[in-house]
């Protein structure tokens, strides 16, 4: 089954290379186990940035070396991606899967274009 996933169209990363956006899904049922995956599309290639499975009401747990962190509140997931550089500019897509209980539902957002601008180095002071 399919469900609608909403996310902002554009986000500008901070000067420290951090970008945050909300991924909201219209849950058709009472899911207890949800999987959220962030995909990146750039240069005709799609790669998985990070993924987390969480139980409703609990925190999202990404892998220790993940560049993503997040919190959940109802049918909203607040995602933060850090360590971004200009070369990481691209379309970041939220994929949500309702894993349990059955039936399985899948939704994929239209993507958030994240722009990353590397900060100018500070000039040397004499």
């Amino acid at each position: 089954k399919a469900m609608h996933v909403a996310q902002p169209a554009v986000v500008l990363a901070s000067s420290r290379g951090i970008a945050s956006f909300v991924c909201e899904y219209a849950s058709p049922g009472k899911a207890t186990e949800v999987r959220v995956t962030v995909l990146r599309q750039a240069d005709s290639q799609v790669t998985e940035v990070c993924a987390a499975t969480y139980m409703m009401g609990n925190e999202l747990t990404f892998l220790d070396d993940s560049i993503c962190t997040g919190t959940s509140s109802g049918n909203q997931v607040n995602l933060t991606i850090q360590g971004l550089r200009a070369m990481d500019t691209g379309l970041y897509i939220c994929k949500v899967e309702l894993m349990y209980p059955p039936p399985y539902y899948l939704g994929i957002g239209n993507g958030t274009q994240i722009y990353v601008i590397d900060p100018e180095p500070c000039p040397d002071s004499d």
Partner: nanobody, 130 residues
């Protein structure tokens, strides 16, 4: 529960033809993308062709002019007509459903496009050999 069942694979000589079918059930979302993917031994899964709910089709460069995707909405069936088959077409062929039509047309030219699809059949083996 969504089910996709492929059929029509087999052994065919180079230059020959096959028609794959994929029967879908349990899927009620009207705006979606249907696709054929293939996976050759030791290689990743790649998008071969897609068709949107509106009927727009797209093909990988390697199969353009040889393969034709179509769908029969009344039968909930997806087809892939494969002509002028080559040994490099040997692979397991899968049909899949993607819930967001935005990524449909670009899938066959995008590496990793399988991420946009979430429902898969069990696959049917196509072997092109003399």
């Amino acid at each position: 529960e969504v089910q996709l069942v492929e059929s029509g694979g087999g052994l065919v000589q180079p230059g020959g033809s096959l028609r794959l079918s994929c029967a879908a059930s349990g899927y009620t979302y009207s705006r979606h993308c249907l696709g054929w993917f293939r996976q050759a031994p030791g290689k990743g899964r790649e998008a071969v062709s897609t068709i949107s709910s509106g009927g727009s089709t797209s093909y990988a460069d390697s199969v353009k002019g040889r393969f034709t995707i179509s769908r029969d909405n009344a039968k909930n069936t997806l087809y892939l007509q494969m002509n002028s088959l080559r040994p490099e077409d040997t692979a397991v062929y899968y049909c899949a459903i993607g819930p967001n039509p935005r990524y449909c047309s670009g899938a066959p030219s995008t590496r990793g496009a399988e991420h946009y699809f979430g429902y898969w059949g069990q696959g049917t083996l196509v072997t092109v050999s003399s």
